[in-house]
């Protein structure tokens, strides 16, 4: 907490400019009017305030806006955002995607912090759903963002937003999340032709049911083993040897290397030995 002291004569700030970087903490507190700071927030990031001085600026804004900052201030916080706690951020109402982008830019190159998670949560709740533009923005800054959401939160993602999702965005998703995302992806990509459809749907297939895998096996898709290994075990078990052979195409030989791992192990145990022998891979059921 900065002590209340009178501003020395001639030091009262008329505007937010670089002369303030030479002010001591107590001088900043005494000589900078909070309302002036709020109206000239756009200047703050162009001025090389020390990290310590940012504490004083935050303190002034907190006093001026005890119920939470207005968006006109939030959008210009820049490095001041790093001084905010999740509790501070919960008081905000952020509606502009540009404001969100500006604050995410400050955190670029870092893992998601509790502050950023709170900011995103406030923003998405304010919008009511994860629209395509928001998803584009969030996955650009945080490729793992989608997989950080609960299945319940993912249910608010409209199918149109799925077009923004890149394969790497789903790397850390678990089966429950893919169960929610897969039907949306299927709907989003339904008008694409066979090979293009498979390219797009491939990274979502961890949520696909048996009947969709059977349908894919009729389309010469040549699924790679990495994708096959991410399929739901309960969806793979009912597939016949012939269906798996068609699904994997030339990649079927990879089953041998994965015979001790799920879902391959469990699938092998469900098959007749005669059928497995037709693959010529030496798989033992």
């Amino acid at each position: 907490e900065v002590e209340k002291t009178a501003c020395p004569s001639g030091k009262k700030a008329r505007e937010i400019d670089e002369s303030l970087i030479f002010y001591k903490k107590w001088e900043l507190e005494a000589c900078v009017d909070a309302a002036l700071l709020a109206t000239q927030m756009d200047r703050v990031n162009a001025i090389p305030f020390t990290y310590e001085q940012l504490d004083v600026l935050k303190h002034k804004l907190d006093e001026l806006y005890p119920q939470g900052y207005p968006e006109s201030v939030i959008q210009h916080l820049g490095y001041l955002f790093l001084k905010m706690s999740p509790e501070d951020i919960r008081k905000w109402n952020v509606t502009s995607l540009e404001t969100l982008k500006a604050l995410l830019e400050v955190n670029k190159g870092h893992e998601m912090s509790p502050q950023v998670a709170t900011l995103i949560d406030r923003f998405v709740k304010g919008r009511g759903q994860l629209d395509k533009d928001t998803l584009d923005t969030l996955t650009a800054f945080y490729p793992g963002y989608l997989c950080s959401l609960s299945p319940e939160e993912l249910s608010s993602v409209p199918p149109s937003s799925i077009w923004a999702v890149r394969p790497q965005d789903l790397d850390t998703c678990d089966p429950r999340q893919l169960d929610v995302l897969y039907p949306k992806a299927r709907l989003a990509f339904q008008n694409m032709n066979g090979s293009e459809y498979f390219v797009k749907i491939q990274s979502f297939l961890g949520g696909a049911p048996t009947e969709d895998l059977k349908a894919l096996s009729q389309q010469n898709v040549s699924m790679d083993l990495a994708t096959f290994m991410k399929l739901r075990t309960d969806a793979v078990l009912p597939l016949t040897v012939a269906e798996v052979q068609k699904l994997l195409g030339p990649h079927v030989e990879g089953l041998k290397a994965e015979e001790r791992h799920r879902p391959v192990r469990d699938w092998i145990l469900r098959q007749r030995q005669d059928d497995l022998d037709t693959l010529g891979l030496g798989l033992q059921g």
């Epitope: 670089e18 162009a46 090389p48 020390t50 990290y51 790093l82």
Partner: antibody, heavy 116, light 107 residues
Framework: EVQLVESGGGLVQPGGSLRLSCAAS????????IHWVRQAPGKGLEWVAS????????TYADSVKGRFTISADTSKNTAYLQMNSLRAEDTAVYYC?????????WGQGTLVTVSS | DIQMTQSPSSLSASVGDRVTITCRAS??????VAWYQQKPGKAPKLLID???RLYSGVPSRFSGSGSGTDFTLTISSLQPEDFATYYC?????????FGQGTKVEIK
């Protein structure tokens, strides 16, 4: 991709001058701050100077004040360190780095040797 | 200027060990501390800033903690690629200052 490339190092006699350059790509230096940090052979890191090109604000370590000048040419996206009155103790690898407070990107460094 | 004192200046450890490096500031620097890793002949690399905020691509075995004057970098399970020199830096006030470094060597 963000990159910083230093150049201009070399062997110079005590009392001599050198100008180091730091060419930036993948970001605009006018929206960042650029710092020079040096490391004497077998020693730790020492901050030397910083510039905020937007306002032209500069700051220096006491050990180089009055002898070194940091500057930037935003049209060339390049920062410079003009080193005058060089001393043996200025011998070091000089790195330029980007960052407002912490330094998230560094160049590969350029060696400055001050010796007669 | 704020002095940053690191300890130990060097340590020997084995792969899988938990390693802790401390950094003490001569005055309060709040959360304004970053940690860097440097390998011989290479530039330093940012690991952590804001005392505990992990930089992208840095393995989660690295963590930072502390506040005020005492800060810690912890490597939960040392890996072969972690043998290097580590530096703390305070950026709370100008000039930014670095610790003298801690060299982590193979036992």
């Amino acid at each position: 991709e963000v990159q910083l490339v230093e150049s201009g190092g070399g062997l110079v006699q005590p009392g001599g001058s050198l100008r180091l350059s730091c060419a930036a790509s993948g970001f605009t230096i006018s929206k960042a701050s650029i710092h020079w940090v040096r490391q004497a052979p077998g020693k730790g890191l020492e901050w030397v100077a910083s510039i905020w090109p937007t306002k032209g604000f500069t700051t220096y370590a006491d050990s180089v004040k009055g002898r070194f000048t940091i500057s930037a040419d935003t049209s060339k996206n390049t920062a410079y360190l003009q080193m005058n009155s060089l001393r043996a103790e200025d011998t070091a690898v000089y790195y330029c780095a980007r960052g407002r407070y912490w330094l998230d990107y560094w160049g590969q460094g350029t060696l400055v040797t001050v010796s007669s | 200027d704020i002095q940053m004192t690191q300890s130990p200046s060097s340590l020997s450890a084995s792969v899988g060990d938990r390693v802790t490096i401390t950094c003490r500031a001569s005055q309060d620097v709040k959360e304004g501390v970053a940690w860097y890793q440097q390998k011989p002949g290479k530039a330093p690399k940012l690991l952590i800033d804001e005392r505990e905020r992990l930089y992208s691509g840095v393995p989660s075995r690295f963590s930072g903690s502390g506040s005020g004057t005492d800060f810690t970098l912890t490597i939960s399970s040392l890996q072969p690629e972690d043998f290097a020199t580590y530096y703390c830096q305070q950026y709370n006030t100008w000039p930014a200052t670095f610790g003298q470094g801690t060299k982590v060597e193979i036992k």
